[in-house]
């Protein structure tokens, strides 16, 4: 079942799947100047049977000035750096995208592709949400959204990240530098996938999956 | 079972300074942004300042700005908040608060009067 | 002043439904942050009611609900009973703030 709204938008943050559930749709859209071969696929279709999952149907795009097809390259450093979709670097990614079963990984580029990706997803996939450069996350642990069905309808849960903005130096004169939390905090703050809740904070959870305080309370 | 205590309010003269302290218990402290937030006699909630999971960085309202600082000792699950040169203003039930903020704790009033 | 608006007061009787308005900018609700609704009845500590727009923490009645359409939100309590009468504040984060605003308070009455 596919979710019907995209995840939820978070101020000064964004989103990444780290795997994508079987059923998940990648549209096969080319950048400006560009489009899709005649008879290509629109979209890319996550399959798989219980141990193996992959992408059906390969995205390819031509020039809108020609006829001739393009075959799939990686795209160059500067413009994979511009697409959306590129690995967040995140001191803590929450899934090893290998190890999970009826999922897919991160489809590779297709030359030409469209800067931003259009994914479909269904019920049951889980994103991550980070905040942007130059915020930085209130709590820490990751803060995910997950697309799920209640009443015959499917909704996203709130991730409840809160990235607050470094306009303002934390220090007056005189007073204590800042303490760091015994468990350390994340190597990179511009990277922080971290969180629970805006308003919730969860019971205990293993240290393995630190997520919110409440969240499974109130979900 | 999350519990927030605060403690260290009282009668204070104008001018003067008091430290609160908030003890956490129930939940992962270290984890998350708390805050403090005070509620004058027969008033609204206002917002008071914020502390991040590890004290990285802070912010407070601007009425408070510059008198008040706001500290967190993660080894010790506690939070606190330093008020200086206090004013009749400032006369308030402080709440500290975990989230932003879902739990509560159930205050400490703090008088300033000559 | 309070950054987001509430109205004062709101009464109904046993039974009835009734709404709280909570009206904010572009730097708090209208920048796309959840709006959260807090319920304090005399002499205690705000409790949590509403989270995220429109979501009810455990040991919450369906009674109350909330919802959120651009720079404004409403909490919802129908069929009214004598206990809901309390202050209700309406609380979302702030950018130019990096802070949480409140609400002025909304005192219901149970006639």
């Known amino acids: 079942e596919l979710c019907d709204d995209d995840p939820p938008e978070i101020p000064h943050a964004t989103f990444k799947a780290m795997a994508y559930k079987e059923g998940t749709m990648l549209n096969c859209e080319c950048k400006r100047g560009f489009r899709r071969i005649k008879s290509g696929s629109l979209y890319m279709l996550c399959t798989g049977n219980s141990s193996h999952s992959s992408w059906d149907n390969q995205c390819q795009c031509t020039s809108s000035a020609t006829r001739n097809t393009t075959k799939q390259v990686t795209p160059q450093p500067e413009e994979q750096k511009e697409r959306k979709t590129t690995e967040m670097q995140s001191p803590m990614q929450p899934v090893d995208q290998a190890s999970l079963p009826g999922h897919c990984r991160e489809p590779p580029p297709w030359e030409n592709e469209a800067t931003e990706r259009i994914y479909h997803f269904v019920v049951g996939q889980m994103v991550y949400y980070q905040c942007v450069q130059g915020y930085r996350a209130l709590h820490r642990g990751p803060a995910e959204s997950v697309c799920k069905m209640t009443h015959g309808k499917t909704r996203w849960t709130q991730p409840q990240l809160i990235c607050t903005g470094e306009m303002e130096t934390s220090q007056f004169p005189g007073e204590e530098k800042p303490q760091a939390s015994p468990e350390g905090r994340p190597e990179s703050e511009t990277s922080c996938l971290v969180t629970t809740t805006d308003f919730q904070i969860q019971t205990e959870m293993a240290a393995t999956m630190e997520t919110s305080i409440f969240t499974t309370e109130y979900q | 079972e999350v519990q927030l205590l605060e403690s260290g309010g009282g009668l204070v003269q104008p001018g003067g300074s008091l430290r609160l302290s908030c003890a956490a218990s129930g939940f992962t402290f270290s984890w998350y942004g708390m805050h403090w937030v005070r509620q004058a006699p027969g008033k609204g909630l206002e917002w008071v300042s914020v502390i991040s999971y590890d004290g990285s960085y802070k912010y407070y309202a601007d009425s408070v700005k510059g008198r008040f600082t706001i500290s967190r000792d993660n080894s010790k699950n506690t939070l606190y908040l330093q008020m200086n040169s206090l004013r009749a203003e400032d006369t308030a039930v402080y709440y500290c608060?975990?989230?932003?903020?879902?739990?509560w704790g159930q205050g400490t009033l703090v008088t300033v009067s000559s | 002043q309070s950054v987001l608006t509430q109205p004062p007061s709101a009464s109904g009787t046993p039974g009835q439904r009734v709404t709280i308005s909570c009206t904010g900018s572009?730097?708090?609700?209208?920048?796309?942050?959840?709006v959260h609704w807090y319920q304090q009845l005399p002499g205690t500590a705000p409790k949590l009611l509403i989270y995220?727009?429109?979501e009810r923490p455990s040991g919450v009645p369906d009674r109350f609900s909330g919802s959120k359409s651009g720079t404004s939100a409403s909490l919802a309590i129908s069929g009214l009973r004598s206990e809901d009468e309390a202050d209700y504040y309406c609380?979302?984060?702030?950018?130019?703030?990096?802070?949480?605003?409140f609400g002025g308070g909304t005192k219901l009455t149970v006639l």
């Open positions: 572009s730097s708090n609700i209208g920048a796309g942050y959840d």
């Open positions: 608060a975990a989230g932003v903020p879902d739990y």
């Open positions: 609380a979302a984060w702030d950018d130019s703030l990096n802070g949480p605003v």
């Open positions: 995220s727009n429109n």
